[in-house]
């Protein structure tokens, strides 16, 4: 059982544990999300992503979650259960990112660019909200990310 993001294979990640970690904090996160009209991981970001694109996109999205979302939210929360869940998610995201090596070859430029444009849509939506709201919404949308990642899961 592994993820196949196009040519990028990821082993050793157990999706069940990611879901368990997310569900442990889901109600808290989504209850704190007051801006229900907006969505960060909108349709245009995740719809019809090709296998070739998927490696670039998941790499940039998970790196953003690690460097911006988990890192900042970690400093804002004190509840042990919440911290434990975020640690589980973050550790698994690190494991995924560490195994992703998107090709930097010139012939992949258009695919890389397409994935980057998708990521920019997500980042733009994130930056339009104030920091607290953006972090909360991003964490509340981890289920959207995990559901999309299922498309690249192999039994």
């Amino acid at each position: 059982q592994e993820f196949h993001f196009g040519p990028c294979q990821v082993k050793g990640v157990v999706p069940q544990k990611l879901w368990e970690a997310f569900w442990a904090v889901k109600d808290t996160m989504q209850a704190q999300d007051n801006i229900t009209s907006a969505r960060l991981l909108q349709q245009e970001v995740l719809q019809n992503v090709s296998d070739a694109e998927s490696c670039y996109l998941v790499h940039t999205l998970l790196e953003f979650y690690l460097k911006t979302v988990f890192k900042n939210y970690h400093n804002r929360t004190v509840e042990v259960r919440t911290l434990k869940s975020f640690s589980t998610l973050a550790n698994n995201f690190v494991l995924i990112v560490s195994q992703l090596q998107p090709s930097q070859e010139n012939e992949m430029f258009s695919i890389r660019d397409s994935a980057h444009r998708r990521f920019l849509l997500f980042r733009r939506a994130f930056k339009q909200l104030d920091v607290e709201a953006a972090l909360t919404k991003a964490l509340g949308e981890v289920d959207i990310l995990l559901t999309w990642m299922q498309k690249f899961y192999k039994l």
């Epitope: 999706p15 069940q16 368990e20």
Partner: antibody
Framework: EVQLVESGGALVQPGGSLRLSCAAS????????MSWVRQAPGKGLEWVSH????????FYAESMKGRATISRDNAKNTLYLQMNSLKSEDTAVYYC????????????WGQGTQVTVSS | SYELTQSPSVSVALRQTAKITCGGD??????VQWYQQKPGQAPVLVIY???RRPSGIPERFSGSNSGNTATLTSSGTQAEDEADYYC?????????FGGGTHLTVL
């Protein structure tokens, strides 16, 4: 080899209660989320409930909220569905299913147990 | 709540191609599973994650998913493919099944 064996189905009167069991083998039970799915006579599949591998997270279909409780005993490799205030529309074959992703990827199913609610 | 729409029945001539569709709002962003069920039997997973085939499922079964429609295709349909087929997704902590399509092989 993955095996799921349901039991506990019976004929019960409206308003009655029933506890279904699903004995699992062939995989590390507590690593996987599990679900109950039912099928009324001549009808389609209807998801009933879901429980995470650690048992901490549970979800229910609207039709069963407040009347059903899903649980698991990881030491016994067994999944349960406690149903109360049963109605005639709960008559169905109840299947337990192993979730291979954690959010509705049912690669393995039991053979089902028949629940009939009738006076 | 999320809904999936399937046409109740599809007919196909033996060894021809059958297409069964599943409609849902922005289903293309969700991961779609397809199950085959024969009378008196439990469902069997035939396609998962839109287009992946579990081991043991014949190569004639394939899947696609884009926009508001997911499609299960049986190329060179065999008599034993006659069954009910259900699409399924996960949405907001709920598993959702389509109403089912009965495939008749003529």
């Amino acid at each position: 080899e993955v095996q799921l064996v349901e039991s506990g189905g019976a004929l019960v009167q409206p308003g009655g209660s029933l506890r279904l069991s699903c004995a699992a083998s062939g995989f590390t039970f507590d690593d996987y989320a599990m679900s109950w799915v039912r099928q009324a006579p001549g009808k389609g599949l209807e998801w009933v409930s879901h429980i995470s591998g650690n048992g901490f997270s549970t979800f229910y279909a609207e039709s069963m909220k407040g009347r059903a409780t899903i649980s698991r005993d990881n030491a016994k490799n067994t999944l349960y569905l406690q149903m109360n205030s049963l109605k005639s529309e709960d008559t169905a074959v109840y299947y337990c299913a192993k979730d291979d992703y954690g959010s509705g990827l049912y690669a393995y199913w039991g053979q089902g147990t028949q629940v009939t609610v009738s006076s | 709540s999320y809904e999936l729409t399937q046409s109740p029945s599809v007919s196909v001539a033996l060894r021809q191609t059958a297409k069964i569709t599943c409609g849902g709002d922005n289903i293309g962003s969700k991961s779609v599973q397809w199950y085959q069920q024969k009378p008196g039997q439990a469902p069997v997973l035939v396609i998962y994650a839109d287009s992946r085939r579990p081991s043991g499922i014949p190569e004639r079964f394939s899947g696609s998913n884009s926009g508001n429609t997911a499609t299960l295709t049986s190329s060179g349909t065999q008599a034993e493919d006659e069954a009910d087929y259900y699409c399924q997704v996960w949405d907001s902590s709920v598993a959702v099944f389509g109403g089912g399509t009965h495939l008749t092989v003529l």
